[in-house]
């Protein structure tokens, strides 16, 4: 906290400029008018203030706007944004995408900080949903943004926004998140033809049910092994050898290298060894000939 002292003669700031970096903390406190600072915030970003000096400037704005800064000031905070706490940001009402972009630009190249996370949360809540423009902006700055949201938060993403999602945006999503996103993607891309549809839906297939995988196997899609390995195990298990062969096309040979990993391992255990042998890949571990397979889960459901 800077104690109140009178501004020395001739030092009263008439504008926000580089002469202020030569002021001591107490001089900044005494000689810079908060209202002047608020109207000329856009100049601060070009001036190399020390961290200590920035603390004083922030303190002045806090005094001027105890209920939270207006958006006209927030948009021009520049690197003073890095001094804000999540508690400060919770007082803000940010509605403009331009303001959001300006502040994300300040943090560009760094991990998402608690401040940025709070800012995004305030912005999205203010909008009521994660619209396409917002999603475009957020994933441009933070490719992993979507996967940082809970399934509940993802449920507010309208299908139309899915067009903004790039494959790398889903890299860190877990199955629960893909379970929410996949139906939205299916809806968003429903009017596309077979091959184009597959290109778009491929990244979301970790949330696809068995029946959709069966349908894809009829369309000569040639799914790569990386995509196959991300599919839900429970969705893969009911697929027949013939369906997997059609689904993977020429990539079916890759199953051999993955035979010890899920979901391939679990799928092999469910297939008849005779059927697996038809692939000619030397996959082992299937059900020997003459054995009967009882689906105990089905039996329990009936009893």
């Amino acid at each position: 906290e800077v104690e109140k002292t009178a501004c020395p003669s001739g030092k009263k700031a008439r504008e926000i400029d580089e002469s202020l970096i030569f002021y001591k903390k107490w001089e900044l406190e005494a000689c810079v008018d908060a209202a002047l600072l608020a109207t000329q915030m856009d100049r601060v970003n070009a001036i190399p203030f020390t961290y200590e000096q920035l603390d004083v400037l922030k303190h002045k704005l806090d005094e001027l706007y105890p209920q939270g800064y207006p958006e006209s000031v927030i948009q021009h905070l520049g690197y003073l944004f890095l001094k804000m706490s999540p508690e400060d940001i919770r007082k803000w009402n940010v509605t403009s995408l331009e303001t959001l972009k300006a502040l994300l630009e300040v943090n560009k190249g760094h991990e998402m900080s608690p401040q940025v996370a709070t800012l995004i949360d305030r912005f999205v809540k203010g909008r009521g949903q994660l619209d396409k423009d917002t999603l475009d902006t957020l994933t441009a700055f933070y490719p992993g943004y979507l996967c940082s949201l809970s399934p509940e938060e993802l449920s507010s993403v309208p299908p139309s926004s899915i067009w903004a999602v790039r494959p790398q945006d889903l890299d860190t999503c877990d199955p629960r998140q893909l379970d929410v996103l996949y139906p939205k993607a299916r809806l968003a891309f429903q009017n596309m033809n077979g091959s184009e549809y597959f290109v778009k839906i491929q990244s979301f297939l970790g949330g696809a049910p068995t029946e959709d995988l069966k349908a894809l196997s009829q369309q000569n899609v040639s799914m790569d092994l990386a995509t196959f390995m991300k599919l839900r195990t429970d969705a893969v298990l009911p697929l027949t050898v013939a369906e997997v062969q059609k689904l993977l096309g020429p990539h079916v040979e890759g199953l051999k290298a993955e035979e010890r990993h899920r979901p391939v391992r679990d799928w092999i255990l469910r297939q008849r060894q005779d059927d697996l042998d038809t692939l000619g890949l030397g996959l082992q571990g299937g059900i020997p000939n003459g054995y009967l397979v009882l689906d105990l889960s089905m039996q329990e459901a009936l009893s």
């Epitope: 580089e18 970003n45 070009a46 001036i47 190399p48 690197y79």
Partner: nanobody, 112 residues
């Protein structure tokens, strides 16, 4: 992003001279004010000299006026600080800054 790298620091006797350089890379510097700061052990960082890249305006701290000169070379994207008549109290780590970006600093020691 802007990267700033200072050089030219060292040990010098009182009354001697040094020339510090700050090489900038990354974003263009026209929109920034550039400055030299210094920080002595146990003291706050203080501004020594500044140059407004677009207007050319120069400002010096009272303690270095007439002894230090800040300049720039646009073609090399480099900032300089010519320090003459050095005193023991000029001993500090000297930092170059442009807007929000800071260099790592270079040590200047004035001692006999």
């Amino acid at each position: 992003q802007v990267q700033l790298v200072e050089s030219g620091g060292g040990l010098v006797q009182p009354g001697g001279s040094l020339r510090l350089s700050c090489a900038a890379s990354g974003r263009t510097l026209e929109s920034y004010v550039m400055a030299w700061f210094r920080q002595a052990p146990g003291k706050e960082r203080e501004a020594v000299a500044s140059i407004n890249w677009s207007s050319g305006r120069l400002i010096y701290a009272d303690s270095v006026k007439g002894r230090f000169t800040i300049s720039r070379d646009n073609s090399k994207n480099t900032l300089y600080l010519q320090m003459n008549s050095l005193r023991a109290e000029d001993t500090a780590v000297y930092y170059c800054a442009a807007g929000r970006y800071w260099g790592q600093g270079t040590q200047v020691t004035v001692s006999s």
